[in-house]
Interface confidence: low
């Protein structure tokens, strides 16, 4: 029988919840990342944005998990057609927005 694709998404959501709940100091020292269009290709777009943050152990697991949702190789500095033009937000806000969107996908059963 097909493997439930909800498993991986659920674990990603749990990791994002963990990040938001355990946040004390500014996440990743207040680093800014490109905001992304959350309507399609969200996993690759999120990875393309977060991969530009280095030296932030709090999101390393998220980066690794997102790698599992994106079929192509993503490198730092890579331009995403899904990013919101010229709009940057703090990593903390990015994570919150992503979490809200992924929870919505999970509820609707849209796992890929």
């Amino acid at each position: 029988s097909p493997v439930p694709p909800s498993t991986a998404l659920k674990e990603l959501i749990e990791e994002l919840v963990n990040i938001t709940q355990n946040q004390k100091a500014p996440l990743c020292n207040g680093s800014m990342v490109w905001s992304i269009n959350l309507t399609a290709g969200v996993y690759c777009a999120a990875l393309e944005s977060l991969i530009n943050v280095s030296g932030c152990s709090a999101i390393e697991k998220t980066q690794r998990m997102l790698n599992g949702f994106c079929p192509h190789k993503v490198s730092a500095g890579q331009f995403s057609s899904l990013r919101v033009r010229d709009t940057k937000i703090e990593v903390a806000q990015f994570v919150k927005d992503l979490l809200v969107h992924l929870k919505k996908l999970f509820r609707e059963g849209q796992f890929n």
């Epitope: 493997v3 694709p5 498993t7 991986a8 674990e11 790698n67 599992g68 079929p71 190789k73």
Partner: antibody, heavy 123, light 106 residues
């Protein structure tokens, strides 16, 4: 502790069949893609087949396509490799490999390997 | 079919740096992985995603990948690093392993 234990290897005549099993423990089996990799005596590694951890996609090396079938039973935490029409060149140690969490199994790397089971095809 | 080519052997003195290359068409556009295999043992993943080390792998192992070549570098090579090393990549719905390189610590 993550463990993979292969079984089912042995001596078989050319044209014969064997079914390899891989019992997994210590991780959420259904969340992971799994692969079979083989190594002929004194030779290098050769990827044989993989089963996605995201959907029911299966993948095969050209050398075994049409002869080998990979399958999995998540309720039993077990991966299988049905090998038909065996040839002398299929003689090898067959490794069961955990292939990383994620829907696209090829992104993660084969980070856990079993000890292998030996298949010998000879008359 | 896609091919990955490695030098058959590399020799290095203890404490020196060993570099193993893996060549394939536009390999830099794909993820590269590296495995270490000692005699009679199962392979061990030492580098994934071109340059990342799994937990438990010493810092002396590093990787890079660009153009047509991926490189595994072992800095301050130790006797325990003597083994066969294989690169790997994903191409057109199949995994491909390199031909393998035997690293000898003199």
């Amino acid at each position: 502790e993550v463990q993979l234990l292969e079984s089912g290897g042995g001596l078989v005549q050319p044209g014969g069949s064997l079914r390899l099993s891989c019992a997994a423990s210590g991780f959420t089996f259904s969340s992971y893609a799994m692969s079979w990799v083989r190594q002929a005596p004194g030779k290098g590694l050769e990827w044989v087949s993989a089963f996605s951890g995201w959907d029911v996609s299966t993948y095969y090396a050209d050398s075994v396509k049409g002869r080998f079938t990979i399958s999995r039973d998540n309720s039993k935490n077990t991966l299988y490799l049905q090998m038909n029409s065996l040839r002398a060149e299929d003689t090898a140690v067959y490794y069961c490999v955990q292939d990383g969490l994620g829907p696209y199994f090829y992104n993660y790397g084969m980070d856990v390997w079993g000890q292998g089971t030996t298949v010998t095809v000879s008359s | 079919s896609y091919e990955l080519t490695q030098p058959p052997s590399v020799s290095v003195s203890p404490g020196q740096t060993a570099s193993i290359t893996c060549s394939g068409d536009k390999l830099g556009d794909k993820y590269s992985f590296w495995f270490q295999q000692k005699p009679g043992q199962s392979p061990v993943l030492v580098i994934y995603h071109d340059s990342k080390r799994p937990s438990g792998i010493p810092e002396r192992f590093s990787g890079s990948n660009s153009g047509d070549t991926a490189t595994l570098t072992i800095s301050g090579t130790q006797a325990m690093d003597e083994a066969d090393y294989y690169c790997q990549a994903w191409d057109s719905s199949t995994y491909v392993f390199g031909t393998g390189t035997k690293v000898t610590v003199l």
